[in-house]
């Protein structure tokens, strides 16, 4: 993690670092939202527990064609120690729902600024 | 537009328990996290803990751990807190306050604050 | 548990003086992420606290330019630059920066 998420300026960043930057760029999404978000695909929706950065990543890898969260899918691979690819499921997707990408960006944020407010970057 | 109101407040006996409620309307408790602080007559502000209503994550400051309980009703967006085996000294105006909704940087909204007497 | 010692208790001045409160933290209020979360508020009587300054040095909206934030590490200043007659009130620094969050113990301004 530590050498990861610095998409802006090489070498390694802080933790800390990396996971503002994934903030700020979901934050980017959601106000530069004019059309819905990925034509309105739906992901499967996750718990947002540990191991929720390779969940969401599960998640989004399945939308193909949108440009607008290419940028998040790299940045929360720096954040998944393995390598996930399109039809991979965790344990963590609550497998029975399915939300909009918009509403998925929106929960994870949240759930992310507050992670960076209590110091919990890993 | 964002509001805090607190109630709850009164009289209560040396040993007794009362429950202060916290309403919060113009946002969503979910989206933030919601503190109760507390003033003395004639002292200064009291941290008591705060609660993350997405998640019942509570945080206290240890001198009330035990006594007080913070909770929340997502669906009715309030904040509550329980305190028992209440002493003269806890008598204060009970405020709750929101962190802003961005970072969490710092609190933007309080109630109008509550009167807790404790007095036999 | 981090302890936010103000001082002075309480200043006399009037209208127009250049009004200095200061904070000093029991250890670095520096969080793991960076930040600083250093707060002052501002109460009038019977009134909930107001925020003026957030992280050290930055002004709430809406707060008089005339409040102004400073400091690092364990030490740190709020400034009026030119007291005002609303300006009479208690004033808090905060650090929410560790759990417990904690108060100074406040900083009473009064009319000479």
């Known amino acids: 993690l530590t050498c990861l998420g610095g998409f802006a300026s090489p070498g390694p960043v802080p933790p800390s670092t990396a996971l503002r930057e994934l903030i700020e760029e979901l934050v980017n999404i959601t106000q530069n939202q004019k059309a819905p978000l990925c034509n309105g695909s739906m992901v499967w929706s996750i718990n947002l527990t540990a191991g929720m950065y390779c969940a969401a990543l599960e998640s989004l890898i399945n939308v193909s064609g949108c440009s607008a969260i290419e940028k998040t899918q790299r940045m929360l691979s720096g954040f998944c120690p393995h390598k996930v690819s399109a039809g991979q499921f965790s344990s963590l997707h609550v497998r029975d729902t399915k939300i909009e990408v918009a509403q998925f960006v929106k929960d994870l944020l949240l759930h992310l600024k507050k992670l960076f407010r209590e110091g919990q970057f890993n | 537009e964002v509001q805090l109101v607190e109630s709850g407040g009164g009289l209560v006996q040396p040993g007794g328990s009362l429950r202060l409620s916290c309403t919060g309307s113009?946002?969503?408790?979910?989206?933030?996290?919601i503190h109760w602080v507390r003033q003395a007559p004639g002292k200064g502000l009291e941290w008591i803990g705060r609660i993350d209503p997405a998640n019942d994550n509570i945080k206290y400051d240890p001198k009330f751990q035990g006594r007080f309980t913070i909770s929340a009703d997502n669906a009715k967006n309030s904040l509550y807190l329980q305190m028992n085996s209440l002493r003269a000294e806890d008598t204060a105006v009970y405020y709750c306050?929101?962190?802003?909704?961005?970072?969490?940087?710092?609190?933007?909204?309080w109630g109008q604050g509550t009167l807790v007497t404790v007095s036999s | 548990d981090i302890q936010m010692t103000q001082s002075p208790s309480s200043l006399s001045a009037s209208v127009g003086d250049r009004v200095t409160i200061t904070c000093r933290s029991s250890?670095?209020?520096?969080?793991?992420?960076?930040?600083?979360?250093l707060e002052w508020y501002q109460q009038k009587p019977g009134k909930a606290p107001k925020l003026l300054i957030y992280k050290v040095s930055n002004r709430f909206s809406g707060v008089p330019s005339r409040f102004s934030g400073s400091g690092s590490g364990t030490d740190f200043t709020l400034t009026i630059s030119s007291l005002q007659p609303e300006d009479f009130a208690t004033y808090y620094c905060f650090q929410g920066s560790h759990i417990p969050y904690t108060f100074g113990g406040g900083t009473k301004v009064e009319i000479k």
């Open positions: 250890q670095s209020i520096v969080h793991s992420n960076g930040n600083t979360y």
């Open positions: 306050a929101r962190s802003e909704e961005n970072w969490y940087d710092f609190f933007d909204y």
């Open positions: 113009g946002f969503n408790i979910k989206d933030t996290y």
